[in-house]
Structure formats: structure tokens, C-alpha cells
């Protein structure tokens, strides 16, 4: 087996004349077994967790993680300083705010310390991996006899987030949803005063500052209006 030489700018000089598909699986050596994929999420740009499925290893292995930023002042290889564990085996690494540089290519390398040739290097765009905290402080105010306005706050730069508002009455079997841009307010033009409304909101780091696919958790729900005589099991399930 030829070895792989790692250079800190993320360009691996690798000769690999031997591949997983080139020999029967019963004769695979440990060094050819694929390493688990690393998945990273940046939580509200406060910390980042990069995790892997440690149980996919044929035997318990404390895999090690190194990282650096390509083409930047931060291109020095860093060792993980705060491992996450699953059943006493490394299964992730947590990076703190000062180690997160959203707009530089993040390079992460997972390695089997007992078999150094067994390594995998991935590149990630952290701005697409941001998950904001759930919206907070939902408030409702009446703009007119039949119009409600929902407001909320986010613990992040407001212009970076888009939002999804869901609402339903206690008569509804499903949510109605509405996309909202960075303005973090939503108006419902016609409210039936005889119904009880429930609203909730979630947010996403998209599209102005990143292209994240993952939404935040839902906010705590907020309610408006009188309790209807019709009991709705959906509503109670929501509040449970």
C-alpha cells in the first residue's frame, strides 16, 4: 500500500494504487476500511460540533481529528482539543467560537492513530452548516379588529436569517405555513375571534450570509384567542 502525505493547505499528495473495489472484501486489511463520515454543524456561530458514527468501526477505536483552514492565516494543522465521546470512544470534536471562521474553507481530517495510513480528509463550507437557536420572545399584537401581528427575536444577526411561521386554529388538522424574510415579523390579515390560534416560528441561516439547509428548532408556541368548545387532540399533543 502506498502512503498519503498530508500538506496543511488541504492538497493531499496521494498515490493510491489500491482501492476498496480492487480486491475481495474478505482480504481487506484494516487500513483499507473506510472511515466514518464527519458531519459538522455550527450552532448559532457560538460553537461547532463535528461528529462521526464511532459504532461503524469494526472494533472500538479512538479516532483522532485534526483540522485547518485552507488558504488562510489559520492554515496551521490543529489537533482537536475537546473530544466528544460515545460509550468512552471518541465520536466527535467541539470547536469554540474563536476557532470558527465561517467564510474560509474548513478542512477536517479523521485518522486511525493505530493505522496512520487510514485517514480521510473532508472539506466543508461552514457558512452552509449554521443552525441558529430557536426564535424567542414571540409576541402578538392586534393591528385591527381582524388583523394580528406576530413578532419574535433571534439571538443572531437578523439580516442573516429567514424564517418559517406556522399557525393553526384549534379547528385545523394541519398547520398553515408562511415564509418570512429577515424582517422577523408576520401579519395575519383575517383572524376569526371565535377560534384559538397557535403560532410557532423557526429560522434558517439563508440566503444572505450562507446557504444552510437545516432549520432551527421550533420556537415555543404562542396562543391567541378564546378556547373553543371543540377539543382538538392535535393542539394538546403540540403543547405536551
Amino acid at each position: 500500500l502506498n502512503t498519503t502525505i498530508l500538506t496543511p493547505n488541504g492538497n493531499e499528495d496521494a498515490t493510491t494504487d489500491f482501492f476498496l473495489t480492487s480486491m475481495p472484501t474478505d482480504s481487506l486489511s484494516v487500513s483499507t476500511l473506510p472511515l466514518p463520515e464527519v458531519q459538522c454543524f455550527v450552532f448559532n456561530v457560538e460553537y461547532m460540533n463535528c461528529t462521526w458514527n464511532s459504532s461503524s468501526e469494526p472494533q472500538p477505536t479512538n479516532l483522532t481529528l485534526h483540522y485547518w483552514y485552507k488558504n488562510s492565516d489559520n492554515d496551521k494543522v490543529q489537533k482537536c482539543s475537546h473530544y466528544l465521546f460515545s460509550e468512552e470512544i471518541t465520536s466527535g470534536c467541539q470547536l469554540q467560537k474563536k476557532e470558527i471562521h465561517l467564510y474560509q474553507t474548513f478542512v477536517v481530517q479523521l485518522q486511525d492513530p493505530r493505522e496512520p495510513r487510514r485517514q480521510a480528509t473532508q472539506m466543508l463550507k461552514l457558512q452552509n452548516l449554521v443552525i441558529p437557536w430557536a426564535p424567542e420572545n414571540l409576541t402578538l399584537r392586534k393591528l385591527s379588529e381582524s388583523q394580528l401581528e406576530l413578532n419574535w427575536n433571534n439571538r443572531f444577526l437578523n439580516h442573516c436569517l429567514e424564517h418559517l411561521v406556522q399557525y393553526r386554529t384549534d379547528w385545523d388538522h394541519s398547520w398553515t405555513e408562511q415564509s418570512v424574510d429577515y424582517r422577523h415579523k408576520f401579519s395575519l390579515p383575517s383572524v376569526d375571534g371565535q377560534k384559538r390560534y397557535t403560532f410557532r416560528v423557526r429560522s434558517r441561516f439563508n440566503p444572505l450570509c450562507g446557504s444552510a439547509q437545516h432549520w432551527s428548532e421550533w420556537s415555543h408556541p404562542i396562543h391567541w384567542g378564546s378556547n373553543s368548545s371543540k377539543e382538538n387532540p392535535f393542539l394538546f399533543a403540540l403543547e405536551a
Epitope: T4, G10, A14, T32, E37, Q39, A120, Q122, L124
Partner: nanobody, 126 residues
Framework: QVQLVESGGGLVQAGGSLRLSCAAS????????MGWFRQAPGKEREFVAV???????FYTDSVEGRFTFSRDNAKNAVYLEMNDLQPEDTAVYYC????????????????????WGRGTQVTVSS
């Protein structure tokens, strides 16, 4: 049986362009990280570019801004548009596929790829 077949290589003058194609059979590439690697005579195989199945694309420093990676899942193919080619780009170019679970997985390590093509020769004359 999985097959990756590269095409589009050839002889070109410095400053010229080529478009490499990699067509797959026996497997859908839609959930694979796809990589391009190259090997020049007497040198080790090196990473050129990678695209995750979520669409994130990365390049080695020396080709950034000159090469463009694209994919067409309907045709089960990926492409490498190479502009402003230089003599140091002369190499055999290989396409590779890595089955991945996550849309963001983009490997730059060649040993992470399970499937490889036989390569296409690119020669840039000065």
C-alpha cells in the same frame, strides 16, 4: 458492475481549454461525492477538485479560478471545465466516486473514494 469512463482529454496549447466528462454506469452518482484527481509522469496522484452531492465544490489551490466542476444527475455524469491550461496541468486525469450519507461530505483524500475511472490524458504544450 460500476464503471466510470472519462473522456475529453487531448493535446492543447498553453492558455487553451478542455472539458473533461465522466460518465457512470452501474450506479447512480446522485448521492456520491465526486472527485477529480490527476497524476503527472513520475509524480504522485493529487487532488484536483471535489463536489459533494449537496453541490459544495472545492478545488486545489493551483486550479482555483481556472477549473469548474459541474454535475448532471439526469445524465449520471460529471464534468471538469478547464480554462487557461498551463504545462504544469499535464497529467492523466481520473474521475472518482465516493458513496456518502451526508450532502456536505466532500473528500479530498484519494483513499476515501471507492470507484475510479481509467483516466484521460491531458497534455498542455508551451
Amino acid at each position: 458492475q460500476v464503471q466510470l469512463v472519462e473522456s475529453g482529454g487531448g493535446l492543447v496549447q498553453a492558455g487553451g481549454s478542455l472539458r473533461l466528462s465522466c460518465a457512470a454506469s452501474g450506479r447512480s452518482l446522485s448521492r456520491d461525492a465526486m472527485g477529480w484527481f490527476r497524476q503527472a509522469p513520475g509524480k504522485e496522484r493529487e487532488f484536483v477538485a471535489v463536489m459533494s452531492w449537496g453541490g459544495d465544490t472545492f478545488y486545489t489551490d493551483s486550479v482555483e479560478g481556472r477549473f469548474t466542476f459541474s454535475r448532471d444527475n439526469a445524465k449520471n455524469a460529471v464534468y471538469l471545465e478547464m480554462n487557461d491550461l498551463q504545462p504544469e496541468d499535464t497529467a492523466v486525469y481520473y474521475c472518482a466516486a465516493a458513496p456518502t450519507s451526508f450532502a456536505t461530505t466532500a473528500y479530498s483524500s484519494s483513499n476515501s473514494y471507492s470507484y475510479w475511472g481509467r483516466g484521460t490524458q491531458v497534455t498542455v504544450s508551451s
